[in-house]
């Protein structure tokens, strides 16, 4: 539960996160498990600890081993382990299984390949992508944020895809590569103009001040795996991330494929500790794909605490 496998290539950056739950204010100490020797926090060191993160800049084969992180809260010390393996770079093109991240699959309509572990790094776009060691070129391939999009996927697109990016630490640059397999599903599907199943247009959602509230934006986009379909929430016409209210966050729900084959997406808007001012906002559920955009608007109203009849509409 609290031991995590991590791997990387020599002379590349590797960043590992302690697998224990903690708060940013907690102190985290890192040790070499075998020697119990403390890992320094000074950034001038090639291997150093930075809170929840252990950084190898760059990694060496000799760094392989088990590292202990101790998360120190005011009440407890909790221990986690990072099992790190650093491999020599292969001279040939073949990427061995032990360097592969989880396989992803796509289809003609949906072909996103995410670059594994990239969220741990300080990187800037664009990513470089390779298939079977060849740089991907041509208009069918688009590097977008932390993923690769392949247009008009064919079965020949299956293979091993490597993303390459630069991690920047205090002005120094380090290369990182990560590889995963991509398989292609043969799927006869279609896409439609988005259909929002929830919320209803102009729905009034009853909430209790001081409680948590969830709003779910749910939309279907057609049959089979969809290409470039998204659901999201806006507050007063502004993206959640730009609105700047930490109590209000959106969280991706499950990708759903119903028995009738419809492909649907959910986005849950979580409002912590509902406040009076939240009732003044306009909440827009947006569903968009290649056909266009559909919007349903929700407003919040104060629920009478002694009105039990509608309590089943309210989730934490």
């Amino acid at each position: 539960k609290f031991s995590k496998q991590s791997w990387g290539l020599e002379n590349e950056a590797l960043i590992v996160r302690c697998p224990r739950q903690g708060k940013p204010s907690y102190t985290v100490d890192w040790y070499y498990s075998q020697t119990n020797k403390s890992i320094p926090t000074q950034e001038r060191n090639r291997v150093f600890a930075s809170g929840q993160l252990l950084k190898f800049l760059p990694a060496a084969v000799a760094d392989s081993g088990i590292y202990t992180c101790i998360v120190r809260s005011p009440t407890f010390n909790r221990t986690g382990y990072a099992n790190v393996t650093i491999y020599k770079k292969q001279s040939d093109c073949n990427v061995p299984d032990y360097l592969m991240y989880s396989t992803v699959s796509g289809s003609e309509k949906n072909s996103k390949i995410y670059c594994p572990t990239i969220d741990l790094y300080n990187w800037t776009a664009p990513l470089e992508w390779f298939k079977n060691c060849q740089a991907l070129q041509g208009s069918r391939y688009r590097a977008h944020k932390s993923f690769l999009v392949i247009d008009n996927v064919m079965t020949e697109d299956a293979g091993d895809y490597t993303c390459k990016f630069i991690h920047n630490e205090n002005g120094a640059n380090y290369s990182v590569t990560a590889t995963r397999s991509f398989t292609v599903k043969d799927e006869q599907g279609f896409s439609l103009f988005p259909v929002i199943g929830a919320p209803a247009q102009n729905e009034i959602k009853e909430v209790e001040i001081g409680k948590n509230a969830n709003l779910t934006c749910s939309a279907c986009f057609g049959k089979g795996t969809q290409f470039l379909a998204a659901v999201l929430w806006q507050l007063n016409g502004t993206k959640i991330t730009d609105f700047g209210e930490p109590r209000i966050q959106q969280e991706e729900g499950q990708n759903q494929s119903f028995s009738n084959g419809l492909a649907c997406l959910d986005m849950v808007l979580r409002i912590a500790d509902v406040k009076e001012e939240d009732l003044l906002l306009q909440y827009d559920c947006l569903a968009l794909n290649l056909h266009g955009l559909r919007r349903h608007t929700v407003r919040l109203s104060r629920k009478n605490p002694i009105d039990h009849h509608s309590h089943h509409h309210h989730h934490h």
Epitope: K23, P74, F76, A272, H316
Partner: antibody, heavy 117, light 106 residues
Framework: EVQLQQSVAELVRPGASVKLSCTAS????????MHWVKQRPEQGLEWIGR????????EYAPKFQDKATMTADTSSNTAYLQLSSLTSEDTAVYYC??????????WGQGTSVTVSS | ETTVTQSPASLSVATGEKVTIRCITN??????IHWYQQKPGEPPKLLIS???TLRPGVPSRFSSSGYGTDFVFTIENTLSEDVADYYC????????FGAGTKLELK
């Protein structure tokens, strides 16, 4: 020495709500998590949930999702538990307890809540 | 949801005897289990934290062992002051207490 001060007892009518308080001394509640635990007469302990007072994030045991609301006021170093739509099933001692994400280290003396008409 | 089955519900021992309490979880939780003692009219007190770690000030006659799904709490040479209810707590997934064990003296 860390101490958690809770009011001793509350007598409330069925259907009403009650808000319990827990004030910490010699400890800044925003530095850790506050848990709430229920204990019915002659029964075992039930975990209600935990709050991260620094940011207000809460997590509830499924059973208490619609019953309990945890809040915290870091300026007064106080955590609160509000219980709504009270019934005789809610008659219990309610403990606040400081700890990390995984367990509780320091406990209050408990507030006895009696629901009776 | 992780559930915890604690046994026995109660037991009666003579002073100096050994006490063994067991908790079984329905999923593998490594060693993320804690043991609490609750004396009458008092709040619970943490005796042993995860990884079988004795809390500061807790006598060494208390110990625990186990990993995965099966956990045991032991009191060697029980004293009269050990009369209390004992609870295990799993914190792998949410938090769940065992039903408790009432320890009495013969």
């Amino acid at each position: 020495e860390v101490q958690l001060q809770q009011s001793v007892a509350e007598l409330v009518r069925p259907g009403a709500s009650v808000k319990l308080s827990c004030t910490a001394s010699a400890f800044n509640i925003k530095d850790d998590y506050m848990h709430w635990v229920k204990q019915r007469p002659e029964q075992g302990l039930e975990w209600i949930g935990r709050i991260d007072p620094a940011i207000g994030n809460t997590e509830y045991a499924p059973k208490f999702q619609d019953k309990a609301t945890m809040t915290a006021d870091t300026s007064s170093n106080t955590a609160y538990l509000q219980l709504s739509s009270l019934t005789s099933e809610d008659t219990a001692v309610y403990y606040c307890a400081l700890g990390d994400f995984y367990a509780m280290a320091y406990w209050g003396q408990g507030t006895s809540v009696t629901v009776s008409s | 949801e992780t559930t915890v089955t604690q046994s026995p519900a109660s037991l009666s021992v003579a002073t100096g005897e050994k006490v063994t309490i067991r908790c079984i979880t329905n999923t593998d939780i490594d060693d993320v289990i804690h043991w609490y003692q609750q004396k009458p009219g008092e709040p619970p007190k943490l005796l042993i934290s995860e990884g079988n770690t004795l809390r500061p000030g807790v006598p060494s006659r208390f110990s625990s062992s186990g990993y995965g799904t099966d956990f045991v709490f032991t009191i060697e040479n029980t004293l009269s002051e050990d009369v209390a209810d004992y609870y295990c707590l799993q914190s792998d997934n949410m938090l769940t207490f065992g039903a408790g064990t009432k320890l009495e003296l013969k």
